[in-house]
């Protein structure tokens, strides 16, 4: 596969991953009430996210409440907020770096410098995926640990919410996409024959021998 194709595919995956990460960050479904027992009738389900918690009644009515105080939040929520927002912002920066290093743009002159910029974009996406993975795994670990802890009240036990799964899928896309961008940049530097062909200038007049100047051909 050509470096340009790797670049495009990598960027598409990173953009989808970025969107998924924004969605995971905003959704109030990082943890959901665990239905451990059918003996006790639970008329409502509780969803908890990084920014708000929602109570869904059995009637389907949903009421959400944004967290009032940052200081009142648990350590893992505060850390998850910071790291997830950090990952989203890093992906934003990575997008511009990747576009600047892309072969189809003219922000940076073609050559080793441009390939290095493209490589930096890929690395930033990889870092973004890793950065997002930390709060997702940390949060999931706490939820699972508390679920199996016999000292935790039954109504305070939660299961992993959809946002965590979306987040994991997003980090996978960011890391695969970032990897492809790095591969594309590496291919570009090590195998220039696989990159976009150079822009042709108008051919000069034939020489006396009738040969065209071959410098524009690979």
């Amino acid at each position: 596969m050509g470096s340009a194709a790797l670049e495009i595919l990598g960027l598409v995956l990173c953009l989808v991953g970025w969107g998924g990460l924004i969605l995971a960050c905003g959704l109030p479904m990082w943890q959901v009430t665990a239905f451990l027992d059918h003996n006790i009738v639970t008329a409502q389900t509780t969803w908890k996210g990084l920014w708000m918690s929602c109570v869904v009644q059995s009637t389907g009515h949903m009421q959400c409440k944004v967290y009032d105080s940052v200081l009142a939040l648990s350590t893992e929520v505060q850390a998850a907020r910071a790291l997830t927002v950090g990952a989203v912002l890093l992906a934003f920066v990575a997008l511009f770096v990747t576009l600047a290093g892309a072969q189809c743009t003219t922000c940076v002159a073609p050559g080793p410098a441009k390939a290095r910029v493209a490589l930096t974009g890929g690395v930033l996406y990889l870092l973004c995926g890793l950065l997002a993975l930390v709060p997702l795994c940390w949060f999931a670990n706490i939820v699972v640990r508390e679920f199996y802890d016999p000292s935790v009240p039954v109504s305070q036990k939660y299961e992993l919410g959809a946002a965590l799964y979306i987040g994991w899928a997003a980090t996978a896309l960011l890391m695969v996409g970032g990897g492809l961008l790095c591969c594309g940049a590496w291919v570009c530097t090590s195998r220039p024959d696989l990159s976009f062909p150079v822009k042709y200038s108008a051919p000069r007049r034939p020489t006396a021998t009738g040969d065209y100047d071959k410098k524009n051909y690979v």
């Epitope: 003996n39 006790i40 508390e146 000292s151 935790v152 109504s155």
Partner: antibody, heavy 116, light 113 residues
Framework: VKVVESGGGLVQPGRSMKLSCAAS????????MAWVRQSPKKGLEWVAS????????YYEDSVKGRFTISRDNAKSTLYLQMNSLRSEDTATYYC??????????WGQGVMVTVSS | DIVMTQSPSFLAVSVGETVTINCKSS????????????LAWYQQKPGQSPKLLIH???TRESGVPDRFIGSGSGTDFTLTISSMQAEDVAIYYC?????????FGAGTKLELK
Amino acid sequence: VKVVESGGGLVQPGRSMKLSCAASGFTFSDYFMAWVRQSPKKGLEWVASINYGGSRTYYEDSVKGRFTISRDNAKSTLYLQMNSLRSEDTATYYCARHPHRLFDYWGQGVMVTVSS
Amino acid sequence: DIVMTQSPSFLAVSVGETVTINCKSSQSFLSSGNQENYLAWYQQKPGQSPKLLIHLASTRESGVPDRFIGSGSGTDFTLTISSMQAEDVAIYYCQQHYDIPYTFGAGTKLELK
């Protein structure tokens, strides 16, 4: 295992009071801890619980927003900050070790009287 | 909230007699996952703090004499003292240790006849 409460006494309605509980004989940070109160009127009543590191706290509805349970694992001490006290908060307050949602070791109790 | 109702509230028995204390919960707290009944029994002797006797309806705490027997399931539970001793004079409480708010029964006062 030993838990010893302190800080009780007479207090006027609307005022604050802080109870302490010094624990020994076990690894304090390995256990949930709780406060349970007892009054002739209401009998035994669970007040609040706190998890190992203090990141999770649980309260009985009537004390929610008024009482704050906290712990200092370095000092093996449990606290109960009681604000906006009411006459119905008059009781003997017990500090208890709280594994598996049980109360397996209790202190001797400390009397809190809310009266004008 | 789960309401715990104890009966009788007072009991006077002779040494050697068998004592039965009942506890009824307003709803079942039998865990469908592990089939455990989250009910505990406590003993509070005069002038002392409560002491845990039994948890999970029938599991005795270490050091608790085997004359104390816990039984029952669903919403109906029983604490049986197979042979009353003078040192068993106390108030006995049941408690659901399933979920918050953890609730106690009003107590059964046990005295010697």
